[in-house]
C-alpha cells in the first residue's frame, strides 16, 4: 500500500492576511484565522512529518479584498509560489479581469501547473495561451506518479469575463478523455481538481471512470467528520464518499473558503492504484497555529502599498453590516439594503417637476455581496472594508425594463432557493413577497414598486407592460447569474459609476449609517 496526503484549499478569495472568524478584516489578532503565513506553518509541519504530500488549490484565489484590487493577481502568484503549491485549478473568478488579467499576473508567473480540462481556447488566443494552462499534469510524488486533472465551472461565462475565445465545455464530457489518457500513461492514481461546486464534484466522482479522488471548490462547501471546530455547519462527512457507476468508493472533499481551513485528506492506494482507505478533516487555521515569520514579513512588505486604501475612514456604522452569504443569499440583509440605498442615492436627478426622481428601484444579486463589516472596529468603514464587500470592480448601471421582465427576474431569484446561490436578489424601492410552497416560476405572490411620478413616494403593484428604470450591477445587466431575461429584454442600458465608489461616496455623505432589515423581502404561504 502507498499513502498520499492531499492538502487543499479553495475559494481563498484574496484572503492573504489573517481574517476574523467570519473571514472579514482581522480586528482582534488573538482570535484571527487563516492567511498565507499561518497556512505555510501548517503545510510545512505536515510536509516534514509525512512523506508523500501534495498541496492543491481548487480555484478562486482571485477576487475578494483590497489585495486583489491593488495587485490584480500578482499577489496570488507570489504567495502561492512561496507556499510551493503543487497545482491549481482555474476558478471562475480567475477570469474577473479578463483573459489578460489571468495570463500576465498568474499563468506566466506561477511556478506550479494551472489546470482545466474543459476550457478550450480558440482563435488568436489559442496560440497565446498554449501551454500556460494544461488539462492535466502528472506529478511525481515519492516513488509514484499522481495524475491531476482540472476542471472549471461551465457557468464561468455567466459569472466572470473570460471573453469570446474560451469555450467552457461540460465538465464530465471533457474530463473523461483526459482521464483515459492518464490511464494510457500507466498513471493509476488520479485526482480531479476543480471548481464547479459540490453537486458537480459528486457527479464527477460518480460518472468519470478512473477518477480516484475529487477535490473541489466554488460552493464553499464545509465537510467535517465529528464535532466542527468553528461556526461552519458541515454539509456532510469529510471525505464525502460517492459510489461511482462502476462500483468504486470515491472520496470527495472541499475546504469551505477564505483560507480559514486547510483540507487534509489521507488516501491509501493499493499497488494497482485503487483507493483502499481515505480519512481526514479540514484543519482550522486558528491562532493556535503561529504565522510563519518569513511569509509574514513578506506580507507586511507587500502590505505597504495597500495602506493608502486601508487608513482612510469613509464614515462609521453603528450596526453590524451583515453581508454574509448565509443571509444575503437567503433573505433580506442590511448590507444589501445599504448598497441599494447608495445606488439610488447616486442616481438622484431631479430633472422633471412631475417626478421626485427618475429612478426608484434597485436590484442586486446577493452573490455579489462578498463580506460583512463588523461595527466593533470603532464603527470605522474604510475603502478596504468595501473592497471586500464589493470586490469585483463592477459598475452600477441604469437600465430600462418592462414590468414583465422584472417579474421574470424575481422568479429567477428564487427558482432554486435554498442552495446558497448568488441570484437571490437584494432590493431597494421594491417590496416583494415569495411563496416557496409554490412551484419554481410561480413563487412571486406580491411585487410592489416605489412610484417615481409622485410627490410622496409610495408602493404600487408592478404593471407588466409598464417600462421602469432600475439601477443594477453591470453583472446583472449583462445577464450574469442566469439573469438572461434582463440582457435579452432590456430596452436601454447606460453604464454607471464604479460600485465601491458609489457606496463609499454614500457613506461619506451620510457620515454615520445604521441600515436595518425592514421588510423589503418577505416570505409567506397561502393565498393573497
Amino acid at each position: 500500500a502507498w499513502e498520499l496526503t492531499i492538502l487543499h484549499t479553495n475559494d481563498v478569495h484574496s484572503r492573504l492576511e489573517q481574517t476574523s472568524e467570519d473571514s472579514s478584516k482581522c480586528v482582534n489578532a488573538s482570535r484571527c484565522m487563516g492567511g498565507v503565513a499561518r497556512l505555510f506553518t501548517k503545510v510545512q509541519q505536515i510536509r516534514r512529518a509525512e512523506p508523500n504530500v501534495l498541496l492543491l488549490d481548487a480555484g478562486d484565489q482571485y477576487q475578494g479584498t483590497i489585495w486583489f484590487t491593488v495587485y490584480k493577481g500578482a499577489e496570488v502568484a507570489h504567495f502561492m509560489n512561496a507556499l510551493r503549491y503543487d497545482a491549481m485549478a482555474l476558478g471562475n473568478h480567475e477570469f474577473d479581469n479578463g483573459v489578460e488579467g489571468l495570463i500576465e499576473p498568474l499563468l506566466k508567473e506561477a511556478k506550479f501547473p494551472i489546470l482545466s480540462a474543459n476550457i478550450k481556447a480558440k482563435g488568436p488566443l489559442a496560440s497565446q495561451i498554449s501551454g500556460l494552462y494544461l488539462p492535466y499534469k502528472v506529478l511525481p510524488v515519492g516513488d509514484e506518479v499522481v495524475g491531476i486533472v482540472g476542471y472549471t465551472s461551465k457557468e464561468t461565462p455567466f459569472l466572470s469575463n473570460p471573453g469570446t475565445n474560451l469555450v467552457f465545455e461540460d465538465e464530465i464530457t471533457a474530463l473523461q478523455p483526459e482521464v483515459d489518457k492518464l490511464k494510457t500513461l500507466n498513471v493509476n492514481k488520479i485526482i480531479a481538481l476543480g471548481h464547479s461546486g459540490f453537486e458537480m464534484d459528486k457527479l464527477i466522482a460518480q460518472k468519470v471512470r478512473g477518477v480516484d479522488v475529487v477535490v473541489g471548490g466554488h460552493s464553499n462547501t464545509f465537510l467535517y467528520t465529528g464535532n466542527p471546530p468553528s461556526k461552519e455547519v458541515p454539509a456532510g462527512k469529510y471525505p464525502f464518499i460517492v459510489t461511482s457507476d462502476d462500483g468504486r468508493k470515491v472520496p470527495v472533499v472541499q475546504a469551505y473558503a477564505f483560507g480559514k481551513y486547510l483540507g487534509y485528506l489521507k488516501i491509501e492506494f493499493d499497488e494497482r492504484g485503487n483507493v483502499i482507505s481515505s480519512h481526514g478533516n479540514p484543519i482550522l487555521l486558528n491562532s493556535s497555529i503561529p504565522e510563519d515569520p518569513s511569509i509574514k514579513a513578506d506580507i507586511n512588505k507587500w502590505r505597504i502599498k495597500l495602506d493608502n486604501y486601508s487608513t482612510q475612514e469613509l464614515g462609521k456604522t453603528i450596526v453590524y453590516l451583515d453581508g454574509s452569504s448565509q443571509s444575503c443569499r437567503f433573505r433580506e440583509c442590511n448590507m444589501g439594503n445599504l448598497i441599494c440605498d447608495a445606488m439610488i442615492n447616486n442616481n438622484l436627478r431631479h430633472t422633471d417637476e412631475m417626478f421626485w426622481n427618475h429612478v426608484s428601484m434597485c436590484i442586486l444579486n446577493g452573490g455579489g455581496i462578498r463580506s460583512p463589516i463588523d461595527e466593533r472596529n470603532n464603527g470605522t468603514i474604510t475603502w478596504e472594508n468595501l473592497a471586500a464587500v464589493l470586490p469585483f470592480g463592477g459598475t452600477f448601471d441604469l437600465v430600462q425594463l418592462k414590468g414583465s421582465t422584472l417579474k421574470k427576474a424575481f422568479e429567477h431569484s428564487v427558482h432554486r432557493y435554498g442552495q446558497s446561490t448568488g441570484e437571490f436578489l437584494q432590493v431597494g424601492g421594491i417590496h416583494v413577497v415569495y411563496d416557496l410552497s409554490r412551484k419554481p416560476g410561480d413563487r412571486v405572490v406580491k411585487l410592489d414598486v416605489l412610484c417615481t411620478k409622485c410627490r410622496v413616494p409610495s408602493y404600487d403593484p408592478l404593471k407588466m407592460d409598464e417600462v421602469y428604470k432600475v439601477i443594477l450591477p453591470n453583472f446583472l445587466a449583462n445577464g450574469g447569474d442566469g439573469f438572461q431575461m434582463i440582457k435579452d429584454e432590456l430596452l436601454r442600458h447606460d453604464s454607471g459609476d464604479q460600485d465601491i465608489n458609489v457606496v463609499s461616496t454614500y457613506i461619506s455623505k451620510m457620515k454615520v449609517i445604521y441600515p436595518a432589515v425592514e421588510g423589503r423581502i418577505k416570505f409567506s404561504t397561502g393565498s393573497h
Epitope: 510551493r84 511556478k111 506550479f112 501551454g131 499534469k137 502528472v138 494510457t184 500513461l185 500507466n186
Partner: antibody, heavy 118, light 107 residues
C-alpha cells in the same frame, strides 16, 4: 520560445566524474520535467532519468542507478546530470529534454559529447 | 522493461515515395507511442506522440497509427529533408524505452 542549452563537450579519464548542465529558458522551469537521454556513437537512445524541478523529485532508470546523479537549481533554471566512475562505454552524447505534458520529449538540448579516454 | 523493436533497421526510398516504419512493443502500450526524427550531429525532434498526434509544426505528411503492441509511422510523400533516422518511443511506463532506429536513405 522554449530553449535548452547544454554545457560544452568534455574529455575525461576513466574513473573521473563529469557534470553536464542544461539551462532552460522561455518557459516556467518548475512546471515541466527535465529528462536526460544517452546516445552512444552510432547507437540508439536510452532514457537515463528525470527531475521534476517543481518538487525536485528524481527518478532513475535502474540501469543507470548508482553512478548518475540528477539535480536542479530552480533559481538558475538549470538541471544537471553528473556521471561518476567513468568508463569507456560512457562515451556518448548526453541530451537533456523537456516534456510537453509528461513522458514524451518535446524539446531537446543540443547535446553534450562526453569522451572517456585514457 | 518494455522492448521496442523497429523494422526495418534501414531502408532506401525516393522523393515522393510513401514510406512506412513499424515498431513492435514487447507488451501492450496502448496508444502511448511517440516518434522522433534525428539527423546526423543533431538532437532528435519530436514528430508524433499519443500514436497519432502531430507535434506543433510537424508537416501533415507524417502520420502515426496503431494500438497495443503494433505501431506505424507513415510518411505519405517523402521530401528531401525527410532523409534521417527515425526512433519510436513508448511513453506508457518507466523506464521509457526507444526502438533501435530506422535509417531512411536516398535510393
Amino acid at each position: 520560445q522554449v530553449q535548452l542549452v547544454q554545457s560544452g563537450a568534455e574529455v575525461k579519464k576513466p574513473g573521473a566524474s563529469v557534470k553536464v548542465s542544461c539551462k532552460a529558458s522561455g518557459y516556467t522551469f518548475t512546471n515541466y520535467y527535465i529528462y536526460w537521454v544517452k546516445q552512444r556513437p552510432g547507437q540508439g537512445l536510452e532514457w537515463i532519468g528525470w527531475i521534476y524541478p517543481g518538487n525536485l523529485n528524481i527518478k532513475y532508470n535502474e540501469k543507470f542507478k548508482g553512478r548518475v546523479t540528477i539535480t536542479a537549481d530552480k533559481s538558475a533554471s538549470t538541471a544537471y546530470m553528473e556521471l561518476s566512475s567513468l568508463r569507456s562505454e560512457d562515451t556518448a552524447v548526453y541530451y537533456c529534454a523537456r516534456d510537453d505534458n509528461y513522458a514524451w520529449f518535446a524539446y531537446w538540448g543540443q547535446g553534450t559529447l562526453v569522451t572517456v579516454s585514457s | 522493461d518494455i522492448q521496442m523493436t523497429q523494422s526495418p533497421s534501414s531502408l532506401s526510398a525516393s522523393v515522393g515515395d510513401r514510406v512506412t516504419i513499424t515498431c513492435k512493443a514487447s507488451q501492450d502500450v496502448s496508444t502511448a507511442v511517440a516518434w522522433y526524427q534525428q539527423k546526423p550531429g543533431k538532437a532528435p525532434k519530436l514528430l508524433i506522440y499519443w500514436t497519432n498526434t502531430r507535434h506543433t509544426g510537424v508537416p501533415s505528411r507524417f502520420s502515426g497509427s496503431g494500438s497495443g503492441t503494433d505501431h506505424t509511422l507513415t510518411i505519405s510523400s517523402l521530401q528531401p529533408e525527410d532523409f534521417a533516422t527515425y526512433y519510436c518511443q513508448q511513453h506508457y511506463s518507466t523506464p521509457f524505452t526507444f526502438g533501435q532506429g530506422t535509417k531512411l536513405e536516398i535510393k
